[in-house]
């Protein structure tokens, strides 16, 4: 018959590494008479034996985990005793090995410039994972503005434009690394002026390009105020470039005027916005420029459809709010007055109305309305319309023929360039050059009259020369 | 308040004839050039005729020449548009619109809501 | 006959700044063009915007503007609104033998 033994463990526990949901072991063997009972606690916390989580075999001496979990770190204790002697213990450690896991990856962060950004990077494992940044494609340097946390968070001081990106941290230890998705860090930067619109002194009818380019992020957009009020005519080209918008209004310049370039972008519900001015002043405003302000366009009215040369251009004088409508409105007047008229002067008459209201235009910087020709202005007045002028001049001066419009619009020949000292300058009549077999045969004028310089009329030429400003009154 | 009704429009055969009437309030009708316009169903616009103030002149969209006639009756204050060897290719809505001035052609500053012109057999 | 041409679509951002232009199949666009805008929404009659190149109906916010830039015309809507949705129209005068009016075929701006 055996003699009683006190417990003795022959294999003391040692420290056992495990990964999560792998399983873990612990050994303790025991010698002794009779059989122990063997106990385990786990940080002096009894281990009860039917806790599926464990299996305790090899009657006690075998303890194992079935799935190791990060909780399950601790000191593991075996304690035998038979009643004999003392009971025995031995403890060992039980450390849970862990991958790196990234338990609150980064997220995607908008940040104004020169503010603070953490990107959060928090992370377990064990042993405890080393947590780098990599931006773009490369590792990120931490320097003065930028450090990785304690906690492997990444906090950017005075966040700058290069800040903007793609960021993933890793998590890396002994077994593995972990990678968190790219996020993008957004910088906005408030809507700054790179180059400001410069003032100009220009000519009248010049035409001016004022450019204002800005910086922001978002690209800001940029609009133009003219006196306070959106900038109605002139057009915008834009340009859109690395964070740059350049802006370019040109402007047909015929007032002076405060142009003042806007540029804003938005911060989530704010936003920001940047501002500069020029000035555009008008060097000479001479008093031609003052009266001949208008524009050049195809005639569409009506009334002197059949006249005027077909897809010429004509001159609108903007001295009217609406020019088109104004000298429509002049014509028919005028042309109501012609019905009393003879047939012979009737359409010779037509002819210099409409060419004198309407008056060929060359559209240059400036926009030129081109007179009649004095010869053919005095070829209607003296041969084809030589009674019915007669008798409109004592009219006229008797204040019978004043109406709403001062007087019919009929110009003054004397005042109208000579096609003899520049053909280019003045406009024929087409219809008189038609005529023109019927005006050599007339009657000499009395000699009260001038004698008409009846043109060798010629062949009629659309000429688009710049001429002196006239006025149509 | 300014406004242009329409009225006439309707279904026809093709080869058959309607007559559209625009009846204009609020404004000096005979001041002003007046135009016809047509939107063919889930289509763009498309200008047909116009006529200015003293109905002087007509004008129109080749392809309606000889078939459709603008006038104006500025007594009533009215503009029509009479319609004839009608084709499917004019069914659409038919706007009767006001220049803003006495000519013809230029900008259509104020638009009636339009009568639909059907052509099917 | 001259095919006057638009976008068929654009889309703009609330604020943001949208062109629309205008041009002819054959040859540019000029102030003989006499240029203009009409906006149309969904079963409304059309509504007049700019005539003449750059002249505003009356009651037509000014965030609406018109002009010539190279061979086209324009129309520029500065800080878009939602109520800006709609299909716009270009109208040119055109003389080629007979006086015409001839529409672009429209261009449905989205206000994203």
């Known amino acids: 018959e055996k003699l009683p033994k006190a417990p003795v463990i022959t294999t003391p526990l040692e420290t056992v590494d495990a990964l999560v949901e792998e399983v873990a072991t612990f050994m303790c063997a025991v010698e002794s008479y009779p059989q122990p009972e063997i106990s385990w606690t786990r940080n002096k916390i009894l281990i009860k034996l039917f806790d599926t989580r464990y299996s305790i075999r090899e009657n006690g001496q075998l303890l194992t985990i079935l799935s190791v979990e990060d909780s399950d770190d601790g000191i593991y204790c075996c304690t035998a005793n038979n009643g004999v002697g003392g009971a025995v213990e031995s403890c060992g450690a039980l450390q849970v090995k862990m991958k790196p896991k990234i338990t609150r990856p980064p997220i995607n962060v908008k940040i104004i410039e020169g503010l603070k950004a953490v990107l959060p990077c928090t992370t377990m494992g064990n042993p405890k994972p080393s947590v780098s940044w990599i931006k773009g494609d490369s590792a990120l340097r931490e320097n003065s503005r930028i450090a990785v946390l304690e906690s492997g968070s990444l906090r950017i001081h005075n966040v700058q434009k290069e800040d903007a990106g793609q960021y993933r941290c890793v998590a890396k230890n002994s077994l593995g690394t972990a990678y968190s998705k790219l996020v993008k860090l957004e910088v906005e930067v408030f809507a700054r002026i790179l180059r400001a619109p410069e003032s100009h002194n220009v000519t009248f009818g010049s035409f001016v390009t004022l450019r204002c380019t800005a910086i922001g992020m978002p690209v800001p957009t940029i609009s133009w105020i003219e006196n306070g009020n959106a900038v109605s005519s002139g057009s915008i080209q834009e340009n859109v470039k690395d964070r740059v918008i350049d802006s370019r209004l040109q402007l047909f310049i015929t007032k002076p005027g405060l142009y003042t370039c806007i540029a804003t972008n938005k911060h989530g519900e704010k936003f920001s916005t940047a501002k500069a001015a020029a000035t555009v002043s008008i060097a000479e405003w001479s008093k031609s420029q003052k009266e001949s302000k208008g524009y050049c366009a195809q005639y569409r009215g009506e009334v002197c459809d059949a006249v005027l040369v077909k897809d010429s251009l004509v001159f609108f004088n903007t001295s009217y709010p609406d020019p088109e409508e104004a000298q429509e409105l002049l014509i028919h007047t005028a042309w109501n007055e012609l019905k009393a008229v003879s047939p012979l002067c009737r359409p010779a008459a037509e002819a210099l109305l409409c060419n004198h209201l309407f008056q060929e235009c060359s559209p240059g910087v400036l926009p030129t309305p081109m007179p009649i020709c004095r010869e053919y202005c005095l070829a209607v007045k003296e041969l084809f319309c030589a009674k019915e002028w007669l008798a409109m001049e004592g009219k006229t001066h008797r204040g019978l023929y004043r109406s709403g419009m001062h007087f019919l619009p009929v110009p003054e020949c004397s005042k109208l360039p000579s096609m003899h000292q520049d053909p280019t300058a003045c406009t024929r009549l087409p219809y008189l050059d038609y005529k023109k077999e019927n005006i050599t045969t007339f009657p000499s004028i009395t000699s009260s009259k001038p004698s008409v310089d009846i043109p060798n009329l010629p062949a009629s030429t659309s000429s688009f020369a710049v001429s002196p400003a006239y006025s149509m009154t | 308040e300014l406004q242009l009704v329409e009225s006439g429009g309707g279904l026809v055969q093709p080869g058959g004839s309607l007559r559209l009437s625009c009846a204009a309030s609020g404004f000096t009708f005979d001041d002003y050039g007046m135009s016809w316009v047509r939107q063919a169903p889930g289509k763009g616009l498309e200008w047909v005729s116009a006529i200015p103030w003293n109905g002087g002149s007509t004008y129109y969209k080749e392809s309606v020449k000889g078939r459709f006639t603008i006038s104006r009756d500025n007594a009533k204050k009215t503009l029509y548009l009479q319609m004839n060897s009608l084709k499917s290719e004019d069914t659409a809505v038919y706007y009767c619109?006001?220049?803003?001035?006495?000519?013809?052609?230029?900008?259509?500053?104020?638009w009636g809501q339009g009568t639909l012109v059907t052509v099917s057999s | 006959q001259a095919v006057v041409t638009q976008e068929p679509s654009l889309s703009v951002s609330p604020g943001g700044t949208v062109t629309l232009t205008c041009g002819l199949s054959s040859g540019s666009v000029t102030s003989s063009n006499y240029p203009d805008w009409y906006q149309q929404t969904p079963g409304q009659a059309p509504r007049g915007l700019i005539y003449?190149?750059?002249s505003r109906h009356s009651g037509v916010p000014s965030r609406f503007s018109g002009s010539i830039s190279g061979n086209k015309a324009a129309l520029t809507i500065t800080g878009a609104q939602s109520e800006d949705e709609a299909d716009y129209y270009c109208g040119l005068y055109m003389y080629s033998g007979s006086k015409n009016y001839v529409f672009g075929g429209g261009t449905k701006l989205t206000v994203l």
């Open positions: 619109a006001k220049r803003s001035g006495r000519i013809a052609f230029g900008a259509l500053d104020a």
């Open positions: 003449s190149t750059d």
